[in-house]
Interface confidence: medium
Protein backbone atom coordinates (compact mmCIF):
# COMPACT_ATOMS: atom_id res chain seq x y z
CA UNK A 1 0.00 0.00 0.00
CA UNK A 2 1.38 3.23 -0.50
CA UNK A 3 1.72 6.18 1.47
CA UNK A 4 -0.57 8.82 0.93
CA UNK A 5 1.37 11.46 1.84
CA UNK A 6 4.86 12.98 2.28
CA UNK A 7 6.72 12.17 5.41
CA UNK A 8 6.67 15.35 7.63
CA UNK A 9 8.58 18.01 7.48
CA UNK A 10 10.97 19.36 10.21
CA UNK A 11 12.26 22.96 10.07
CA UNK A 12 15.98 22.81 9.69
CA UNK A 13 16.60 19.09 9.04
CA UNK A 14 15.94 16.42 6.11
CA UNK A 15 15.01 12.89 6.42
CA UNK A 16 16.60 9.65 4.87
CA UNK A 17 16.00 5.73 4.56
CA UNK A 18 18.48 3.80 5.14
CA UNK A 19 16.69 1.27 3.41
CA UNK A 20 13.52 0.14 1.21
CA UNK A 21 10.71 -1.48 2.19
CA UNK A 22 9.33 -4.24 -0.71
CA UNK A 23 7.37 -2.44 -2.93
CA UNK A 24 8.99 1.52 -2.83
CA UNK A 25 9.40 2.73 -6.41
CA UNK A 26 11.78 5.30 -7.29
CA UNK A 27 11.30 7.52 -9.81
CA UNK A 28 13.55 7.50 -13.12
CA UNK A 29 14.73 11.21 -13.34
CA UNK A 30 16.99 12.16 -15.81
CA UNK A 31 19.26 15.80 -15.23
CA UNK A 32 18.32 19.00 -17.47
CA UNK A 33 19.36 18.35 -20.97
CA UNK A 34 18.69 14.33 -20.49
CA UNK A 35 15.55 12.33 -20.84
CA UNK A 36 14.31 8.56 -20.46
CA UNK A 37 15.81 6.72 -23.36
CA UNK A 38 12.67 5.64 -25.37
CA UNK A 39 10.29 3.15 -23.84
CA UNK A 40 12.85 3.01 -20.57
CA UNK A 41 11.33 2.30 -17.75
CA UNK A 42 9.13 4.94 -15.47
CA UNK A 43 10.94 3.73 -11.99
CA UNK A 44 12.69 1.44 -10.29
CA UNK A 45 10.83 -1.33 -7.79
CA UNK A 46 11.63 -2.70 -5.04
CA UNK A 47 10.89 -6.59 -5.29
CA UNK A 48 11.97 -9.69 -3.44
CA UNK A 49 11.95 -12.86 -2.22
CA UNK A 50 11.91 -14.35 0.85
CA UNK A 51 15.73 -14.19 1.07
CA UNK A 52 16.73 -11.37 -1.45
CA UNK A 53 15.64 -7.92 -2.06
CA UNK A 54 16.73 -5.86 -5.12
CA UNK A 55 15.77 -3.07 -7.54
CA UNK A 56 13.71 -3.87 -10.76
CA UNK A 57 14.58 -2.64 -13.68
CA UNK A 58 16.97 0.17 -14.13
CA UNK A 59 17.06 3.72 -14.86
CA UNK A 60 18.29 5.35 -18.22
CA UNK A 61 19.07 8.81 -19.46
CA UNK A 62 20.38 9.84 -22.84
CA UNK A 63 21.08 13.34 -24.23
CA UNK A 64 17.62 15.35 -25.09
CA UNK A 65 19.41 16.54 -28.16
CA UNK A 66 19.62 13.88 -29.73
CA UNK A 67 15.54 13.09 -29.81
CA UNK A 68 13.39 15.30 -32.33
CA UNK A 69 10.25 14.19 -31.28
CA UNK A 70 8.41 14.23 -27.77
CA UNK A 71 10.51 16.23 -24.91
CA UNK A 72 9.93 14.99 -21.31
CA UNK A 73 9.05 17.43 -18.91
CA UNK A 74 11.88 17.06 -15.92
CA UNK A 75 9.97 19.29 -13.03
CA UNK A 76 12.26 21.68 -11.25
CA UNK A 77 14.13 21.73 -8.32
CA UNK A 78 11.64 23.72 -6.68
CA UNK A 79 9.14 21.12 -7.88
CA UNK A 80 10.95 18.03 -6.58
CA UNK A 81 10.74 19.61 -3.32
CA UNK A 82 7.15 19.28 -3.18
CA UNK A 83 7.20 15.52 -3.47
CA UNK A 84 9.02 12.51 -1.69
CA UNK A 85 12.91 13.33 -2.30
CA UNK A 86 16.23 12.38 -0.84
CA UNK A 87 18.85 14.25 -1.30
CA UNK A 88 21.70 11.57 -2.83
CA UNK A 89 24.12 12.97 -0.95
CA UNK A 90 23.41 12.44 2.92
CA UNK A 91 26.06 12.67 5.60
CA UNK A 92 24.30 9.95 7.23
CA UNK A 93 26.04 6.49 7.42
CA UNK A 94 23.43 3.53 6.58
CA UNK A 95 22.96 1.12 8.82
CA UNK A 96 23.80 -2.69 7.75
CA UNK A 97 21.23 -2.73 5.00
CA UNK A 98 21.83 -6.44 4.44
CA UNK A 99 20.49 -7.36 8.06
CA UNK A 100 17.19 -6.10 7.03
CA UNK A 101 14.77 -8.87 4.91
CA UNK A 102 12.35 -7.07 2.90
CA UNK A 103 14.50 -4.76 2.22
CA UNK A 104 16.64 -2.79 -0.74
CA UNK A 105 19.51 -1.20 -0.58
CA UNK A 106 19.87 2.37 -1.42
CA UNK A 107 20.33 1.91 -5.54
CA UNK A 108 23.34 3.01 -7.24
CA UNK A 109 23.15 6.42 -8.79
CA UNK A 110 22.74 6.08 -12.35
CA UNK A 111 24.42 8.30 -15.64
CA UNK A 112 22.99 11.66 -15.64
CA UNK A 113 20.52 11.26 -13.38
CA UNK A 114 18.53 14.16 -11.35
CA UNK A 115 20.11 15.85 -8.46
CA UNK A 116 17.34 14.97 -6.13
CA UNK A 117 15.57 11.28 -6.31
CA UNK A 118 11.89 10.77 -6.12
CA UNK A 119 10.51 7.71 -3.99
CA UNK A 120 7.03 6.70 -3.51
CA UNK A 121 7.36 4.86 0.01
CA UNK A 122 4.74 2.12 0.93
CA UNK A 123 3.17 1.56 4.45
CA UNK A 124 5.71 0.30 7.15
CA UNK A 125 8.73 2.66 5.49
CA UNK A 126 10.71 4.15 8.29
CA UNK A 127 12.87 7.41 7.72
CA UNK A 128 15.61 9.01 9.85
CA UNK A 129 16.28 12.48 10.72
CA UNK A 130 18.78 14.30 11.26
CA UNK A 131 19.71 18.51 11.06
CA UNK A 132 21.10 20.51 8.68
CA UNK A 133 24.37 21.60 8.95
CA UNK A 134 24.49 24.49 11.46
CA UNK A 135 21.76 23.18 13.25
CA UNK A 136 21.85 20.82 16.37
CA UNK A 137 19.29 18.43 17.20
CA UNK A 138 17.38 18.66 20.45
CA UNK A 139 15.70 15.01 20.91
CA UNK A 140 12.32 14.90 22.95
CA UNK A 141 12.30 10.74 21.45
CA UNK A 142 12.76 9.32 18.13
CA UNK A 143 14.05 11.14 15.01
CA UNK A 144 12.48 8.86 12.93
CA UNK A 145 8.96 8.68 11.24
CA UNK A 146 7.10 5.66 10.14
CA UNK A 147 4.26 5.41 7.56
CA UNK A 148 1.28 3.55 9.48
CA UNK A 149 -1.77 2.48 8.03
CA UNK A 150 -5.00 3.53 10.37
CA UNK A 151 -8.61 3.11 9.42
CA UNK A 152 -7.54 2.67 6.11
CA UNK A 153 -5.76 5.68 5.71
CA UNK A 154 -1.88 6.14 5.44
CA UNK A 155 -0.04 8.40 7.95
CA UNK A 156 3.48 9.48 8.84
CA UNK A 157 4.51 9.52 13.14
CA UNK A 158 5.65 12.46 14.24
CA UNK A 159 9.35 12.49 14.94
CA UNK A 160 10.50 14.23 17.90
CA UNK A 161 13.30 16.41 16.88
CA UNK A 162 14.03 20.01 17.08
CA UNK A 163 16.78 21.91 15.17
CA UNK A 164 18.12 25.00 16.37
CA UNK A 165 20.47 27.21 15.32
CA UNK B 1 -12.14 7.45 0.16
CA UNK B 2 -10.75 9.13 -3.09
CA UNK B 3 -13.76 10.15 -5.52
CA UNK B 4 -12.90 11.69 -9.19
CA UNK B 5 -15.50 13.85 -11.49
CA UNK B 6 -15.29 14.81 -15.11
CA UNK B 7 -17.11 17.98 -16.52
CA UNK B 8 -16.97 19.74 -19.74
CA UNK B 9 -18.44 20.10 -22.87
CA UNK B 10 -20.20 17.56 -24.26
CA UNK B 11 -20.06 18.65 -27.84
CA UNK B 12 -17.35 20.39 -29.60
CA UNK B 13 -16.76 21.38 -33.18
CA UNK B 14 -14.12 20.04 -35.46
CA UNK B 15 -10.95 22.03 -35.55
CA UNK B 16 -12.01 23.55 -31.94
CA UNK B 17 -10.17 22.45 -28.68
CA UNK B 18 -12.11 20.01 -26.30
CA UNK B 19 -11.57 21.10 -22.22
CA UNK B 20 -12.01 18.90 -19.86
CA UNK B 21 -11.58 18.60 -15.82
CA UNK B 22 -11.34 16.34 -13.24
CA UNK B 23 -12.44 17.42 -9.48
CA UNK B 24 -10.81 15.11 -6.95
CA UNK B 25 -12.95 14.44 -3.36
CA UNK B 26 -12.15 13.07 -0.31
CA UNK B 27 -8.33 13.29 -1.10
CA UNK B 28 -5.43 15.78 -2.12
CA UNK B 29 -4.30 16.04 -5.25
CA UNK B 30 -1.00 16.77 -3.57
CA UNK B 31 -0.44 13.07 -2.61
CA UNK B 32 2.73 11.80 -2.42
CA UNK B 33 2.94 8.37 -5.17
CA UNK B 34 0.12 9.46 -7.34
CA UNK B 35 0.07 10.62 -10.80
CA UNK B 36 -3.75 11.84 -12.41
CA UNK B 37 -4.23 10.46 -15.75
CA UNK B 38 -6.63 11.22 -18.65
CA UNK B 39 -7.62 7.84 -20.75
CA UNK B 40 -10.36 8.08 -23.65
CA UNK B 41 -12.32 5.04 -24.82
CA UNK B 42 -14.18 5.64 -28.53
CA UNK B 43 -17.24 3.75 -28.86
CA UNK B 44 -17.20 0.05 -28.84
CA UNK B 45 -13.09 0.23 -28.80
CA UNK B 46 -10.19 0.36 -26.05
CA UNK B 47 -8.66 2.18 -24.11
CA UNK B 48 -5.87 4.54 -24.97
CA UNK B 49 -3.88 6.21 -22.23
CA UNK B 50 -3.54 10.36 -23.30
CA UNK B 51 -1.04 11.34 -20.91
CA UNK B 52 -0.73 12.23 -16.99
CA UNK B 53 0.99 14.82 -14.72
CA UNK B 54 2.38 14.85 -11.06
CA UNK B 55 0.62 17.44 -8.57
CA UNK B 56 4.26 19.27 -9.08
CA UNK B 57 3.33 20.23 -12.87
CA UNK B 58 5.58 17.58 -14.70
CA UNK B 59 3.69 15.98 -17.41
CA UNK B 60 3.93 12.74 -19.69
CA UNK B 61 1.99 12.73 -22.81
CA UNK B 62 1.32 9.30 -25.47
CA UNK B 63 3.26 10.75 -28.31
CA UNK B 64 0.78 10.16 -30.62
CA UNK B 65 -1.38 12.74 -29.23
CA UNK B 66 1.32 15.21 -27.63
CA UNK B 67 1.60 18.00 -30.41
CA UNK B 68 -2.67 18.57 -29.17
CA UNK B 69 -2.54 17.73 -25.76
CA UNK B 70 -2.24 19.98 -22.23
CA UNK B 71 -2.79 18.36 -19.20
CA UNK B 72 -2.61 20.83 -16.05
CA UNK B 73 -3.58 20.94 -12.24
CA UNK B 74 -4.65 23.18 -9.92
CA UNK B 75 -3.85 22.11 -6.70
CA UNK B 76 -5.75 25.11 -4.79
CA UNK B 77 -9.39 23.88 -6.79
CA UNK B 78 -7.81 20.09 -6.18
CA UNK B 79 -8.51 19.22 -9.71
CA UNK B 80 -6.56 18.66 -12.94
CA UNK B 81 -7.87 19.53 -16.31
CA UNK B 82 -6.92 18.12 -20.03
CA UNK B 83 -7.22 20.62 -23.32
CA UNK B 84 -6.90 18.87 -26.52
CA UNK B 85 -6.47 20.90 -29.74
CA UNK B 86 -7.24 20.63 -32.81
CA UNK B 87 -10.11 17.67 -32.84
CA UNK B 88 -11.59 15.77 -35.17
CA UNK B 89 -14.73 13.16 -35.22
CA UNK B 90 -12.00 10.51 -34.50
CA UNK B 91 -11.65 12.17 -30.86
CA UNK B 92 -14.92 11.30 -30.13
CA UNK B 93 -14.67 9.16 -26.84
CA UNK B 94 -15.43 8.77 -23.35
CA UNK B 95 -13.26 10.42 -21.63
CA UNK B 96 -12.00 9.05 -18.18
CA UNK B 97 -10.03 10.46 -15.17
CA UNK B 98 -7.91 8.23 -13.00
CA UNK B 99 -5.60 8.21 -10.32
CA UNK B 100 -2.85 5.79 -10.80
CA UNK B 101 0.01 4.28 -8.95
CA UNK B 102 2.39 3.16 -11.08
CA UNK B 103 3.37 -0.60 -10.79
CA UNK B 104 0.03 -0.01 -8.28
CA UNK B 105 -2.45 0.52 -11.64
CA UNK B 106 -5.19 2.85 -11.98
CA UNK B 107 -6.82 2.30 -8.86
CA UNK B 108 -9.70 5.38 -8.59
CA UNK B 109 -12.00 6.76 -11.94
CA UNK B 110 -13.96 8.74 -12.92
CA UNK B 111 -17.53 7.71 -13.91
CA UNK B 112 -16.34 8.81 -17.56
CA UNK B 113 -17.51 11.42 -19.72
CA UNK B 114 -18.83 11.36 -23.56
CA UNK B 115 -17.48 13.88 -25.67
CA UNK B 116 -19.45 14.33 -29.48
CA UNK B 117 -17.01 15.92 -32.23
CA UNK B 118 -19.53 17.09 -34.84
CA UNK B 119 -20.33 20.50 -36.82
CA UNK C 1 6.02 1.61 -27.62
CA UNK C 2 5.19 -1.84 -25.86
CA UNK C 3 2.52 -3.21 -27.45
CA UNK C 4 0.23 -5.58 -25.52
CA UNK C 5 -1.46 -8.80 -27.29
CA UNK C 6 -4.73 -9.85 -25.44
CA UNK C 7 -6.36 -13.07 -26.71
CA UNK C 8 -9.27 -14.08 -27.03
CA UNK C 9 -11.02 -10.95 -27.84
CA UNK C 10 -14.02 -12.52 -26.79
CA UNK C 11 -15.61 -15.77 -25.08
CA UNK C 12 -18.58 -17.40 -24.32
CA UNK C 13 -18.53 -19.36 -20.80
CA UNK C 14 -21.59 -20.56 -18.24
CA UNK C 15 -21.51 -19.42 -14.78
CA UNK C 16 -19.40 -22.04 -12.75
CA UNK C 17 -17.02 -21.94 -15.48
CA UNK C 18 -13.22 -21.15 -15.20
CA UNK C 19 -12.14 -18.60 -17.54
CA UNK C 20 -8.36 -17.59 -18.52
CA UNK C 21 -7.39 -14.01 -20.55
CA UNK C 22 -3.99 -14.00 -21.58
CA UNK C 23 -2.31 -10.88 -22.99
CA UNK C 24 1.17 -10.93 -24.66
CA UNK C 25 3.87 -7.84 -23.87
CA UNK C 26 6.50 -6.79 -26.92
CA UNK C 27 9.34 -6.82 -24.98
CA UNK C 28 9.89 -7.81 -21.72
CA UNK C 29 8.37 -5.93 -19.11
CA UNK C 30 8.72 -7.89 -15.33
CA UNK C 31 5.46 -7.77 -13.62
CA UNK C 32 4.62 -4.22 -14.77
CA UNK C 33 0.87 -5.37 -15.57
CA UNK C 34 -2.97 -4.61 -14.21
CA UNK C 35 -6.08 -5.85 -15.14
CA UNK C 36 -9.26 -4.11 -15.24
CA UNK C 37 -12.63 -4.96 -15.32
CA UNK C 38 -15.59 -2.76 -17.13
CA UNK C 39 -19.64 -3.13 -17.56
CA UNK C 40 -20.94 -1.43 -20.23
CA UNK C 41 -21.52 2.56 -19.20
CA UNK C 42 -19.29 2.19 -16.48
CA UNK C 43 -15.64 2.62 -16.05
CA UNK C 44 -13.25 0.58 -15.70
CA UNK C 45 -12.70 -0.66 -12.39
CA UNK C 46 -8.64 -2.29 -11.13
CA UNK C 47 -8.63 -5.97 -10.08
CA UNK C 48 -5.01 -6.95 -9.99
CA UNK C 49 -2.04 -4.91 -9.99
CA UNK C 50 2.03 -5.83 -10.13
CA UNK C 51 0.50 -9.04 -12.76
CA UNK C 52 -0.71 -10.82 -9.47
CA UNK C 53 -1.51 -8.84 -6.79
CA UNK C 54 -5.55 -8.80 -5.95
CA UNK C 55 -6.95 -4.92 -5.42
CA UNK C 56 -8.45 -4.61 -2.03
CA UNK C 57 -12.11 -5.26 -2.18
CA UNK C 58 -11.61 -7.44 -5.22
CA UNK C 59 -13.07 -11.75 -4.91
CA UNK C 60 -10.59 -14.15 -4.45
CA UNK C 61 -11.88 -16.07 -7.79
CA UNK C 62 -9.89 -13.22 -9.98
CA UNK C 63 -6.39 -14.01 -10.13
CA UNK C 64 -3.14 -13.11 -11.93
CA UNK C 65 0.06 -14.70 -12.90
CA UNK C 66 3.00 -14.25 -15.21
CA UNK C 67 6.17 -11.74 -15.83
CA UNK C 68 8.20 -11.10 -18.69
CA UNK C 69 5.98 -10.93 -22.06
CA UNK C 70 3.40 -13.37 -21.00
CA UNK C 71 0.21 -12.46 -18.90
CA UNK C 72 -2.67 -14.29 -17.38
CA UNK C 73 -5.79 -13.39 -15.93
CA UNK C 74 -7.99 -16.17 -14.72
CA UNK C 75 -11.78 -16.49 -13.12
CA UNK C 76 -12.61 -19.62 -10.84
CA UNK C 77 -16.13 -19.98 -10.86
CA UNK C 78 -17.77 -17.68 -12.96
CA UNK C 79 -20.27 -15.67 -11.26
CA UNK C 80 -23.29 -13.52 -12.94
CA UNK C 81 -21.59 -10.09 -12.10
CA UNK C 82 -18.71 -11.44 -13.81
CA UNK C 83 -19.86 -11.14 -17.73
CA UNK C 84 -18.17 -8.06 -18.63
CA UNK C 85 -14.85 -6.83 -20.44
CA UNK C 86 -11.57 -7.42 -19.55
CA UNK C 87 -8.61 -5.29 -19.80
CA UNK C 88 -4.99 -5.77 -19.12
CA UNK C 89 -2.72 -2.76 -19.29
CA UNK C 90 1.21 -2.01 -18.91
CA UNK C 91 2.99 0.23 -16.34
CA UNK C 92 6.40 -0.48 -17.48
CA UNK C 93 7.06 2.68 -19.59
CA UNK C 94 5.34 5.39 -21.53
CA UNK C 95 3.04 5.50 -23.53
CA UNK C 96 1.25 3.37 -21.23
CA UNK C 97 -0.42 0.68 -23.79
CA UNK C 98 -3.51 -1.60 -22.86
CA UNK C 99 -4.92 -4.46 -24.62
CA UNK C 100 -7.48 -4.53 -27.03
CA UNK C 101 -9.59 -6.32 -24.61
CA UNK C 102 -11.71 -9.36 -24.04
CA UNK C 103 -15.35 -9.79 -23.69
CA UNK C 104 -17.02 -12.59 -21.59
CA UNK C 105 -20.48 -13.10 -21.99
CA UNK C 106 -22.33 -16.07 -21.32
CA UNK C 107 -22.96 -18.92 -22.92
Known amino acids: ELCDDDPPEIPHATFKAMAYKEGTMLNCECKRGFRRIKSGSLYMLCTGSSSHSSWDNQCQCTSSATRSTTKQVTPQPEEQKERKTTEMQSPMQPVDQASLPGHCREPPPWENEATERIYHFVVGQMVYYQCVQGYRALHRGPAESVCKMTHGKTRWTQPQLICTG | QVQLQESGSGLVKPSQTLSLTCAVS??????????WSWIRQPPGKGLEWIGY???????YYNPSLKSRVTISVDRSKNQFSLKLSSVTAADTAVYYC???????????WGQGTTVTVSS | DIVMTQTPSSLSASVGDRVAITCQASRNIWSYVNWYQQKPGEAPRLLIYGASTLQRGVPSRFSGSGSGTGFTLTINSLQPEDFATYFCQQSHSTPITFGGGTRVDIK
Open chain 2, 26 to 35: GGSISSGGYS
Open chain 2, 98 to 108: ARAGYYYGMDV
Open chain 2, 53 to 59: IYHSGST
